[in-house]
Amino acid sequence: CRTSECCFQDPPYSDADSGSASGPRDLSCYRISSAGYECSWQYEGPTAGVSHFLRCCLSSGRCCYFATGSATRLQFSDQAGVSVLHTVTLWVESWARNRTEKSPEVTLQLYKSVKYKPPLGDIKVSKLAGQLRMEWETPDNQVGAEVQFRHRTPSSSWKLGDCGPQDDDTESCLCPLEMNVAQEFQLRRRRLGSQGSSWSKWSSPVCVPPENPPQPQVRFSVEQLGRDGRRRLTLKEQPTQLELPEGCQGPAPGVEVTYQLQLHMLSCPCKAKATRTLPLEKMPYLSGAAYNVAVISSNRFGPGPNQTWHIPADTHTEPVALNISVGTNGTTMYWPARAQSTTYCIEWQPVGQEGSLATCNLTAPQDPDPAGMATYSWSRESGAMGQEKCYHITIFASAHPKKLTLWSTVLSTYHFGGNASAAGTPHHVSVKNHSLDSVSVDWAPSLLSTCPGVLKEYVVRCRDEDSNQVSEHPVQPTETQVTLSDLRAGVAYTVQVRADTAWLRGAWSQPQRFSIKVQVSD
């Protein structure tokens, strides 16, 4: 027999199959050109001394063989004696060490057996009613296919599935979608309606994330407020990375989980924009305001669960950087200005009502005045900070008020509203004899003392009614008692107390008369 022809004789070995686990398998035969054909197969086991024979039986019952030696691939033409227009049965017999091993048979019509390609190029992945839908362009001239998929997770081996028959320019497949683990998919195709035809190779891996992106497990810390009125938000713990199946390790597109940082500035609600989203790696600087920070995880199917943290306001207050002057027309605040064309947000809230919404005012962009100060004024009619109570005032600044990450804290302080001079007057002034020439003066704390940093000092005034001589005694704001010494017995005195702020002199309390009794000696 000629080597290019199928030999219609008995093969040169005994044809008993040894039935061992090794041997030829995965035989596939197909047309490779108008008149050319190819069969190839795998051989499992030691290859030394193995001779392969491709066997073919025609529908008439006549059989022939090709001897391929150690090769596991054979090309032949339509002139090789094998009928290409009619159904034939093919298998491989491998002879080694006096035993023969046989592959499973394939029955097919060679002319119609075109080598099918797997899905090529871009395989689109989407979610459809809780399932995974894959879609791709049908390879050229290969409309009409049967499609299979196989899939695995990081902890499971391949499972086979069927996509069903396809008969269009685009093909698709519905596959199971895992809730919490990533999957690797591969697809293969063969000619529709020819069971004996061979499958294409498996496609490149299609990497699919879980339906739910993982909950981002991260921790934040926030630094101290710097001199520029900003503090750094830092990520203490990076989000854990998703475990991936073998074929999806490396730069596999499709399974990426992206994390975004969503900032919501809770303070200063009257500003132009309260939220901003950033890529997670770009950890921002924040003002001393209160914020909610969310980390949002998302994958190709959309956003997943997010984790939200509350970053409390920085409670550090400035020692009186704010000057407030109350006039007949209204009230004006002054503070050290920032750069040219800065927008300020002035926020205030009665102390003890932190849960309620703060009052907020946004200034137009302003330049520093000649003294380097910025100002904000309001009329008495507006009623702003008009009640006689303690207010917490915070001033924020930004040259880019719409950029949430560019706000900074200018100052945070307290102010006593309304007529602080009168409201702060100490009450319940009492005088007690202390010794032969001294008394102890006590009073109830001023309302101003409820407002941190507002009360600068108390002043106690003592007047000798005989000589009209007056002495004044400054008292620390934390004290509500003073001893007046060097008093003369039998002289009438009046005592008054006032409470002063840094910018305002208080009103004197009602005069309290007293005298030290003259001691009569026995």
Epitope: T258, T277, P279, M283, P284, Y285, R300, H400, T405
Partner: antibody, heavy 119, light 107 residues
């Protein structure tokens, strides 16, 4: 006023080296992530590389065409960004811009400096 | 790498016309997109950040919209000083990538 001023450009032969500098003022340079972006004559914009702030590790990243040949560095006390360019090729001819990192806080660009690689 | 496809590459419009430029990202970039204006011989100048926010000091005739993969930049009423090349840029992922640019001319 914010300013980024590039210097150190000029004509260099293929295979040669050049070091660009970018002097920054008007903002807290040490906090900023900085980039180099280039623009070949008559063409579009192309990112070259980035350096993070020291507080963020000071790590660098590069575009594929320049990786292994270009190095971005910074000197925070001097408020200066650098681009060391080695093994220059004719296709590296471009105007090189020093910029702050986009989408974070502010977006500043230098006026650009021309680098010509020609024999 | 994320590809940014900008169209058209050039356009000619009359003063007062509404001009629209589109930018398409090859993958989802959320709203991490800038629009720049570049005049001949000058550095690019940021007009829009976060896909739709107007940079401080930029005239309100410029606007941006979109999220995910499809973005639009609009000049509501073209002015003579708007003659320039406009670029989109994504900052979702490294490498930072720009669109090919749109050259805007006056008819």
């Amino acid at each position: 006023e914010v300013q980024l001023v590039e210097s150190g450009g000029g004509l260099v032969k293929p295979g040669g080296s050049l070091r660009l500098s970018c002097a920054a003022s008007g903002f807290t340079f040490s906090n900023a992530w900085m980039n180099w972006v280039r623009q070949a004559p008559g063409k579009g914009l192309e990112w070259v590389g980035r350096i993070k702030s020291k507080t963020d590790g000071g790590t660098t990243d590069y575009a594929a065409p320049v990786k292994g040949r270009f190095t971005v560095s910074r000197d925070d006390p001097k408020n200066t960004l650098y681009l060391q360019m080695n093994s220059l090729k004719t296709e590296d001819t471009a105007v090189y811009y020093c910029t702050t990192d986009p989408g974070w806080e502010f977006d500043y660009w230098g006026q650009g400096i021309l680098v010509t690689v020609s024999s | 790498d994320i590809q940014m496809t900008q169209s058209p590459s050039s356009l000619s419009a009359s003063v007062g016309d509404r001009v629209t430029i589109t930018c398409q990202a090859s993958q989802d970039i959320s709203n991490f997109l800038n629009w720049y204006q570049q005049k001949p011989g000058k550095a690019p100048n940021l007009l829009i950040y976060d896909a739709s926010d107007l940079e401080t000091g930029v005239p309100s005739r410029f606007s941006g919209s979109g999220s995910g993969t499809d973005f639009t930049f609009t000049i509501s009423s073209l002015q003579p000083e708007d003659i320039a090349t406009y670029y989109c840029q994504q900052y979702d992922n490294l490498p930072l990538t720009f669109g090919g640019g749109t050259k805007v001319e006056i008819k």
